[in-house]
């Protein structure tokens, strides 16, 4: 029984490789999936000597390890690309690295959007 799941319909979208892949660079993504399947948001990034380089953000297909995650938290120690997923609209706006070995928690806030 999937109890109390946060339904995901929209995620923050970002693609660092947008020119090569001929997509938008950033925005919102409306999630589409098969009936009865859950949807999630995700974020992926690199950390080069403390400098965060966002790779991609968007919708993520039904994945059991993402169920019931309200926040986007990566736990791998030192991967090439950090990954987190979560449930709930725009839950991937901010993302966190909380290493399993008990290192410091680092949360990455999105830059404030300039007023138009």
């Amino acid at each position: 029984s999937g109890r109390g799941e946060a339904e995901t319909r929209e995620c923050i979208y970002y693609n660092a490789n947008w020119e090569l892949e001929r997509t938008n660079q950033s925005g919102l993504e409306r999630c589409e999936g098969e009936q009865d399947k859950r949807l999630h948001c995700y974020a992926s990034w690199r950390n080069s000597s403390g400098t965060i380089e966002l790779v991609k953000k968007g919708c993520w297909l039904d994945d059991f390890n993402c169920y019931d995650r309200q926040e986007c938290v990566a736990t791998e120690e030192n991967p090439q690309v950090y990954f987190c997923c979560c449930e709930g609209n725009f839950c991937n706006e901010r993302f966190t690295h909380l290493p399993e070995a008990g290192g410091p928690e680092v949360t990455y806030e999105p830059p404030p959007t300039a007023p138009t």
Epitope: L61, D63, N65, Y67, D68
Partner: antibody, heavy 118, light 111 residues
Framework: EVQLLESGGGLVQPGGSLRLSCAAS????????MAWVRQAPGKGLEWVSG????????FYTDSVKGRFTVSRDNSRNTLYLQMNSLRAEDTAVYYC???????????WGQGTLVTVSS | QTVVTQEPSFSVSPGGTVTLTCGFN?????????PSWYQQTPGQAPRTLIY???TRSSGVPDRFSGSILGNKAALTITGAQADDESDYYC??????????FGGGTKLTVLG
Amino acid sequence: EVQLLESGGGLVQPGGSLRLSCAASGFTFRNYAMAWVRQAPGKGLEWVSGISVTGGSTFYTDSVKGRFTVSRDNSRNTLYLQMNSLRAEDTAVYYCAKVYYTSFFDYWGQGTLVTVSS
Amino acid sequence: QTVVTQEPSFSVSPGGTVTLTCGFNSGSVSTSYYPSWYQQTPGQAPRTLIYNTNTRSSGVPDRFSGSILGNKAALTITGAQADDESDYYCVLWMGSGIWVFGGGTKLTVLG
């Protein structure tokens, strides 16, 4: 090193109950979904149950629905499978498995044997 | 009821190549089912070989590879060795909390 150690198996009569435990170490248990998989003697693997990181979502194969209950205690790094109204066809080795992103089983325990017989 | 099908048995000569397949009765297997493959020798726990269609698990030799072939998931073993003689299981993630295992393939390495 990731380790999953099942316990609680044994011989039980039809209609009886058992509670299996899976003690996890070597990783942050609360960060990963978990599953139970079983294998009847001389047969193939069969997924039994899965539980999300918080325990808020639980799922079962049809043949055990209403009889088995999966749970987890993240403070004790332990996964459980409460098995009630056991039947002869539940006789199997029960494995616990850690679930990783893209929904695969990346680590397995060594299993515990459950025998249902009169 | 979803049924996942594998060849019940397969034989390969040492050094040869074998491809095991994994299909199901409800249509084509695609990457969205996150097909994964496991090796099991008698009396042992399963060992993870391939996940997410084609990603090798840590420590798995590159003789093992995964793919989608037509409408099925496939596991290919190139340069088969005697200790590859095992049972091989595929698993499909159906979503909504449900996995389905194939019936397994018993691989015999001849000679």
